[in-house]
């Protein structure tokens, strides 16, 4: 008969530029070697070969080099794959063609994600404003997927639906950036607020404006930056926002613009005689020349890393001068937890095992929750240790001692406080005596 | 003229710290860079490191990462550069420069320098 | 951040030419137009000769002259005169807002 291929039923989601493994398992029969298997992964519409395992041997990945089996758990049955470095064209359905003497194929489906930036709010006309003015109010996102939906209320959560514009453009990695336009008739005064939703992450990233028409102080530069931290994903490149109101006939030459480490004062990158310094940062930072001469004095911090977390200060100084600072928030996704359990098999009922599950790779350190079948919380006899490797990610090793029933199924679910991203796995442990993982 | 006026000698155990000051006159202390540049007795130039005035942003040689700071005092036109954890080869007469208002400018105008001596 | 690396000493009689060389990287010299030069007399701050390469900041003799080829950049004194006589100093920027100096030439009037 048919060999029976499993795979999950959901799709698989994964953020853009980390790993996933698209699980796939069959039952091998006793007596089995892995000279007896052949294996194929391929994308399941254009049939495009992406990994095999045949004659005993790992044939290697045939999709850009970033695929890998589990070598040492093929004997069990586990034919997962491992994509490296997702990308938003990796999207799709992956075919999993197991054959011993039998043969079976189960396909399943990888959802790309990428959370939208919090986004930045801009106003045309932004000074000398008055009650009655029509003022152009632009909510930018950027690098999300999939595609994001956008929503405008005002100050007392009335949805705004009129005369509001969205676009959303693709960049050449497939990450989308939008801009969503809300033209409006000032009152005395309003607060104007836009979400941008990623409906496969069911992230929401808001920002507002509250507009108070009136003649702007003269004096000090008004240098503005959002109030809340940027989040940025470890290896990912992040901006942090920051604009000035330039006044009629403003020249780049008068600007001097420093980025610097709010604390240490250590310098990041600045712009003077009117012309780019360049990065004093591991060469890491970028400004954007071209939107300077309009007040746009954001920086650009690539291939972010966990030390990167802090505040950095956008200093402005034309004929008067002004600073402020934006917070940086470094996180990284937590990978799917992987459960052992010890002792692991002829266990019977009454028996006192523990259980661990250990995620990795994540930033910042963890909540880690564990619950019984029924959704109980399991509270006692629970043990976490979080460990930071060089590049200060997280690996989170939670071990739980229980006593066990008749039978009993064992989760833990590890959250990301930053991302809010809950990463779980669980243990289901039936019959007796038992042995974990079930045989065949 | 454009003058920097540097903080007298100073003789400090191993171990302790040391600031040296540097009071700009003559141009606009906020528009130019300050370098300081070390010189042990008998040895070469040395880089230290800078300090934009206009912020207070740093920038360090990396020899002297987590042992140096430079502040400045705009209302005195002054700029400082502390160096803790003194060991004897600190020993050197250390140097305010004028750098331009870019970076990767040459030093034109330098004060006339003070002598720290590292002794126990 | 390595020194840059320069002869020890070079001498010449008055009237003569000599070249002082300034070997460093692509990091430093190779990379970036802006070399600097310095004299510096026994118990005195270091006086600037030569920027950015070649050029002269006004009340600098032209008898000082400054180029660069590759890595190395080097300063030409010509006819030599008894008041040249002492410590020159080559200084490149380094990237990332960071300076290097040279080692230093004892130049010997004969």
């Known amino acids: 008969g048919a060999l029976e291929v499993q795979v999950p039923e959901d799709p698989v989601v994964a953020l853009v530029g980390t790993d996933a493994t698209l699980c796939c398992s069959f039952s091998p029969e006793p007596g089995f070697s892995l000279a007896q298997l052949n294996l194929i992964w391929q994308l399941t519409d254009t049939k495009q070969l992406v990994h095999s395992f045949a004659e005993g041997q790992d044939q290697g990945s045939a999709y850009a080099n970033r695929t890998a089996l589990f070598p040492d758990l093929l004997a069990q049955g586990n034919a997962s794959l491992r994509l490296q470095r997702v990308r938003v064209a990796d999207e799709g359905s992956f075919t999993c063609f197991v054959s011993i003497r039998d043969f079976g194929s189960a396909a399943v489906s990888l959802q790309v994600a990428a959370p939208y930036s919090k986004p930045s709010m801009t106003l045309e006309p932004n000074k000398d404003l008055r009650p009655g003015d029509t003022v152009t109010i632009t909510c930018s996102s950027y690098q999300g997927y999939p595609e994001a939906e956008v929503f405008w209320q005002d100050g007392q959560g009335v949805p705004l639906t009129g005369n509001v514009t969205t676009s959303q453009m693709a960049n050449e990695q497939g990450l989308f950036d939008v801009h969503s336009i809300l033209r409006v008739v000032l009152g005395a005064n309003g607060t104007y607020s836009c979400l941008v939703r990623n409906p496969v992450l069911q992230q929401d990233a808001h920002s507002s404006v509250t507009i108070t028409p009136q003649r702007s102080p003269t004096g000090a530069v008004e240098v503005q930056v959002p109030e809340d931290p940027v989040v940025a994903l470890v290896g990912t490149d992040a901006t942090l926002r920051c604009s000035f109101s330039p006044e009629p006939g403003f020249s780049l030459a008068q600007l001097n613009l420093i980025w610097q480490l709010t604390d240490t004062k250590q310098l990041v990158h600045s712009f003077t005689e009117g012309r780019d310094q360049g990065s004093a940062y591991a060469n890491r930072t970028a400004l954007f020349p071209d939107l300077l001469a309009q007040g746009n004095a954001s920086l650009r911090l690539q291939r972010v890393r966990v030390a990167d977390e802090g505040s950095f200060t956008c200093f402005v100084s034309i004929r008067d001068f002004g600073s402020a600072a934006v917070s940086l928030q470094v996180a990284a996704p937590y990978s799917k937890p992987s459960m052992t359990l010890e002792p692991n098999k002829d266990l019977r009922p009454g028996d006192t095992v523990t259980i661990t599950c250990s995620s990795y790779r994540g930033y910042p350190e963890a909540e880690v929750f564990w619950q019984d079948g029924q959704g109980v919380p399991l509270t006692g006899n629970v043990t976490t240790s979080q460990m930071a490797n060089e590049q200060g990610l997280f690996d989170v090793h939670s071990v739980l001692r229980v006593v066990l029933g008749a039978n009993g199924t064992y989760s833990c679910l590890v959250r990301n406080p930053v991302l809010q991203q809950d990463a779980h796995g669980s243990v289901t442990i039936t019959g007796q005596p038992m042995t974990f993982p079930p045989e065949a | 003229q454009v003058q920097l006026q540097q903080s007298g000698a100073e003789v400090e155990k191993p171990g302790a710290s040391v600031e040296v000051s540097c009071r700009a006159s003559?141009?606009?202390?906020?528009?130019?860079?300050i370098h300081w540049v070390r010189q042990a007795p008998g040895q070469g130039l040395e880089w230290v490191g800078m300090i934009t005035p206009l912020s207070g942003g740093t920038t360090y040689a990396q020899k002297f990462q987590g042992r140096v700071t430079m502040t400045r005092d705009t209302s005195t036109s002054t700029v400082y550069m502390n160096l803790s954890s003194l060991r004897s080869e600190d020993t050197a007469v250390y140097f305010c420069a004028r750098g331009g208002r870019a970076v990767a400018s040459s030093f034109e105008f330098w004060g006339q320098g003070t002598l720290v001596t590292v002794s126990s | 951040q390595s020194v840059l690396t320069q002869p020890r000493s070079v001498s010449g009689s008055p009237g003569q030419s000599v070249t002082i060389s300034c070997t460093g990287t692509s990091s430093d010299v190779g990379g970036y137009n802006y070399v600097s030069w310095y004299q510096q007399h026994p118990g005195k701050a270091p006086k600037l000769m030569i920027y950015?390469?070649?050029k002269r900041p006004s009340g600098v003799p032209d008898r000082f002259s400054g180029s660069k080829s590759g890595n190395t950049a080097s300063l030409t004194i010509s006819g030599l005169q008894a008041e040249d006589e002492a410590d020159y100093y080559c200084?490149?920027?380094?990237?990332?807002?960071?300076?290097?100096f040279g080692t230093g030439t004892k130049v010997t009037v004969l």
């Open positions: 003559g141009y606009t202390f906020t528009s130019y860079y």
């Open positions: 950015d390469v070649s």
């Open positions: 200084c490149s920027y380094a990237g990332s807002y960071t300076e290097v």
